[in-house]
Interface confidence: low
C-alpha cells in the first residue's frame, strides 16, 4: 500500500477507564497531513462520531472507556501530499484489582509509572494524563495504598504531588485519579505509580548524562525549521523520563494550541553497559519570541538547554 512503517508502541491498559493515544511523529505530522486510525488491519477507519465509545478525535484515538475486547493492534496512517507513514500501537487490556488486598493491591503492569523519591529531600510525583482537548480533566486526587493522601507534607500542584522531607515510609503503591468529562459524561482516570525511595542524588544510583545539548546557543534564521536532538546516556534499568520543556512546561503543552514547537518520539540504542536515548524538539517555524528563551532537555535529574539566537549580520554582503 506504499506506506512506510515507522514504529510499534506497546501499551498495557486498565479496563473500565478512558485511554487516548495521539498519532504524532514530528516533523511528519507537522505539515499538511491527514491522520486516520484503523483497528487490526481493518480497511474501515475508526469512527469519528464523538458519541462512539471508540472514536478518532483529530489526531487522537479515544476510548471512553477501554473494554476487554479492545485489545489488539491499532494503526495510525499519516498521509501527506507525497508520503504515507504508519504507526502501530499494540494495546493490551487488563482488569486491575485496585484495592483488593487479597490480590495484593496495585498490579505491577507496564502501564504503571515507576517513580523515585529522594530520602530527606523535597521531591514530587507526576500524574501523566494525556487526552485531547475535547476531554476536560478535573482536579487530581492522590492515593497511597488506596487511602486519599492528606497531611502537611503533601501538596497537590496541578499534575504533581509535592512531598516535603521524604521519608522511608513514603515508598509504596500510589495512584493519581482525575474525573474526565467528555460530551457531558464523566469517567474516572486512574494511574498507578510504584514509588521507591533512594538516598542517592541520582536516579537508581546513576545520574543520566546529557551528551547534547551542552547549555549553548544556536544561531538560526527567523522563519526556518529547526530540529534539535537531545542525546542522553543512562543505565539500562533506569526509570527516568526524558522530555523537552520551556518555562518549566512540557513543550507539547506550552504550544498546545499552535503545535508550532513539538517534542518528537523518543528512540534508543542499546549498548552493553548503557542505553543512548534521543528525543528531539522540532521548531516548525522559528519566531522572534523563541530567541533568548532556554529550551531545556530534562533527563531525570539532569538538564541541559539550548538558546536560539539570530545570526550576526553578514556585512560582507554590503
Amino acid at each position: 500500500d506504499g506506506c512506510k512503517d515507522i514504529f510499534m508502541k506497546n501499551e498495557i491498559l486498565s479496563a473500565s477507564q478512558p485511554f487516548a493515544f495521539n498519532c504524532t511523529f514530528p516533523p511528519i505530522t507537522s505539515g499538511e497531513v491527514s491522520v486516520t486510525w484503523y483497528k487490526n488491519s481493518s480497511k474501515i477507519p475508526v469512527s469519528k462520531i464523538i458519541q462512539s465509545r471508540i472514536h478518532q478525535d483529530e489526531t487522537w484515538i479515544l476510548f471512553l472507556p477501554m473494554e476487554w475486547g479492545d485489545s489488539g493492534v491499532y494503526q495510525c496512517v499519516i498521509k501527506g501530499r507525497d508520503s504515507c507513514h504508519r504507526i502501530h500501537v499494540n494495546l493490551t487490556v487488563f482488569e486491575k484489582h485496585w484495592c483488593d488486598t487479597s490480590i495484593g493491591g496495585l498490579p505491577n503492569l507496564s502501564d504503571e509509572y515507576k517513580q523515585i523519591l529522594h530520602l530527606g529531600k523535597d521531591d514530587s510525583l507526576t500524574c501523566h494524563l494525556h487526552f485531547p482537548k475535547s476531554c476536560v480533566l478535573g482536579p487530581i486526587k492522590w492515593y497511597k495504598d488506596c487511602n486519599e493522601i492528606k497531611g502537611e507534607r503533601f501538596t497537590v500542584l496541578e499534575t504533581r504531588l509535592l512531598v516535603s522531607n521524604v521519608s522511608a515510609e513514603d515508598r509504596g503503591n500510589y495512584a493519581c485519579q482525575a474525573i474526565l468529562t467528555h460530551s457531558g459524561k464523566q469517567y474516572e482516570v486512574l494511574n498507578g505509580i510504584t514509588v521507591s525511595i533512594t538516598e542517592r542524588a541520582g536516579y537508581g544510583g546513576s545520574v543520566p548524562k546529557i551528551i547534547y545539548p551542552k547549555n549553548h546557543s544556536i544561531e538560526v534564521q527567523l522563519g526556518t525549521t529547526l530540529i534539535v536532538d537531545c542525546n542522553v546516556t543512562d543505565t539500562k534499568d533506569n526509570t527516568n523520563l526524558r522530555c523537552w520543556r520551556v518555562n518549566n512546561t512540557l513543550v507539547d503543552d506550552y504550544y498546545d494550541e499552535s503545535k508550532r514547537i513539538r517534542e518528537g518520539v523518543e528512540t534508543h540504542v542499546s549498548f552493553r553497559e548503557h542505553n543512548l536515548y534521543t528525543v528531539n524538539i522540532t521548531f516548525l517555524e522559528v519566531k522572534m519570541e523563541d530567541y533568548g528563551l532556554p529550551f531545556m532537555c530534562h533527563a531525570g535529574v539532569s538538564t541541559a538547554y539550548i538558546i536560539l539566537q539570530l545570526p550576526a549580520p553578514d556585512f560582507r554582503a554590503y
Epitope: 479496563a15 473500565s16 477507564q17 465509545r53 471512553l64 472507556p65 473494554e67 482488569e95 484489582h97 485496585w98 484495592c99 483488593d100 490480590i103 486526587k141 492515593y143 488506596c146 487511602n147 486519599e148 495512584a175 485519579q177 474525573i179 459524561k185 464523566q186 469517567y187 474516572e188 486512574l190
Partner: nanobody, 128 residues
Framework: DVQLVESGGGLVQPGGSLRLSCAAS????????LGWYRQAPGKQREAVAT????????YYSDSVKGRFTISQDNAKTTVYLQMNSLRAEDTAVYYC?????????????????????SGQGTLVTVSS
C-alpha cells in the same frame, strides 16, 4: 441521564431474607463502583456493601458481613443485595448508589460519600 431504580424492599420477620435489586439505566459506560447504603430514622447513613465496576472487589460493613451478599448481572447494569438472617436493626431505607471512583473511600466503607448518582430508596422493615 443516569437513573438508579431500587426494588425488592418490604416487611420481613427477623431471621427472614430479602433480595434488593438496583437497575441502572442511562449508562454509556461501566461505573467504577456500585453499591448500597442505608439510613435508619435519626441515624447516620451507612455504607452497607459495594462492588467494583469489574466485579473484582467487594466491601461489606462489619454489621452485615456474613449475612449480606452483593453481586452484579453479567451486563453490569444491575446490582443485587441478598439479605439473609435479617435483624430489627437492619430496618432502614436502602439506597442504591453509583460512584465514579473505585478508590473513593465510600467504595471501601469510608465515611465520605463520593458516589455520583443515587436512587430514591426502598424501605426494608424487619419486624415480628
Amino acid at each position: 441521564d443516569v437513573q438508579l431504580v431500587e426494588s425488592g424492599g418490604g416487611l420481613v420477620q427477623p431471621g427472614g431474607s430479602l433480595r434488593l435489586s438496583c437497575a441502572a439505566s442511562g449508562y454509556s459506560y461501566r461505573t467504577q463502583c456500585l453499591g448500597w447504603y442505608r439510613q435508619a430514622p435519626g441515624k447516620q447513613r451507612e455504607a452497607v456493601a459495594t462492588i467494583s465496576g469489574g466485579g473484582t472487589s467487594t466491601y461489606y460493613s462489619d454489621s452485615v458481613k456474613g449475612r449480606f451478599t452483593i453481586s452484579q448481572d453479567n451486563a453490569k447494569t444491575t446490582v443485587y443485595l441478598q439479605m439473609n438472617s435479617l435483624r430489627a436493626e437492619d430496618t432502614a431505607v436502602y439506597y442504591c448508589a453509583a460512584g465514579l471512583s473505585v478508590l473513593g473511600s465510600w467504595c471501601h466503607g469510608g465515611s465520605s460519600y463520593e458516589y455520583t448518582y443515587s436512587g430514591q430508596g426502598t424501605l426494608v422493615t424487619v419486624s415480628s
